[in-house]
Amino acid sequence: HGTELPSPPSVWFEAEFFHHILHWTPIPNQSESTCYEVALLRYGIESWNSISNCSQTLSYDLTAVTLDLYHSNGYRARVRAVDGSRHSNWTVTNTRFSVDEVTLTVGSVNLEIHNGFILGKIQLPRPKMAPANDTYESIFSHFREYEIAIRKVPGNFTFTHKKVKHENFSLLTSGEVGEFCVQVKPSVASRSNKGMWSKEECISLTRQYFTVTN
């Protein structure tokens, strides 16, 4: 029955650390019975492996079948539309999915106050799917960096930025009081990976946190 259906216009990965999601755009005028077949190719093993015969969503979680991503040459994925006995041509991801494509995140940020300083501790991601030995700090073992952004609330869109090279950091508030909110964006200096801003953590600074010294 050939290739009567149009192909998905685009296919791409959106990945965080051990959270590898394949996305695609729907074919135009798809019917209620249209679904999508997903296949995966691991570089070095030059054959396509069928992952899902009929996904009715526009994304598929490939984490479980790409757990070795961080120790491999990467993957390509392809998707085609299926409707009954008809199917489209395959649409293949146009870039190799490798560790370089993983967007870096932090798990959370903890804040406390000490003598007018905001002290922060960055918790690294600990995804459930990750094998025990594949921690964030073992895979990205060197040159971890973090952009820290702080804003005073209420306020508008004004952030003050600072770059740090450790999971622990301190911020001087210049004697100001009020609520301060912090977001963190990770990077690795030796890599090209993008980073995502963390969830905002806020802390209230009042006069009681300042020690008077002569």
């Epitope: 959106e14 999601i21 526009l58 967007t103 995804p127 964006k185 995502m196 963390s198 905002e200």
Partner: nanobody, 127 residues
Framework: QVQLQESGGGSVQAGGSLRLSCAVS????????MGWFRQAPGKEREGVAT????????YYADSVKGRFTISQDNAKNTVYLQMNSLKPEDTAMYYC????????????????????WGQGTQVTVSS
Amino acid sequence: QVQLQESGGGSVQAGGSLRLSCAVSGYSYSSNCMGWFRQAPGKEREGVATIHTGGGSTYYADSVKGRFTISQDNAKNTVYLQMNSLKPEDTAMYYCAAEPLSRLYGGSCPTPTFGYWGQGTQVTVSS
């Protein structure tokens, strides 16, 4: 590739209304910080409003609170800025921006930086 396409700008009298649209394509839409920014001639770009597309929370600059409303249509991958009671000082080029947020760990809006920007749409308010 990611594309943000703004529309809906134009010229209007003071007190009038406009509705700007920003259509997102090229990446998934489920968890992002989407923002509207503006830049008047000779001035720095300033934030106007943001929306968290996953949670729906919104944030506004003081100068537009009560007059502007940011909203989303998930089915159309589109974010809107409804601008009412427009003033001459609202005259500017308006830009749509997007920053992906973590699906695993969440994120907040506004983000300190935005990675994707549209080309802008001009809004002119005359007195």
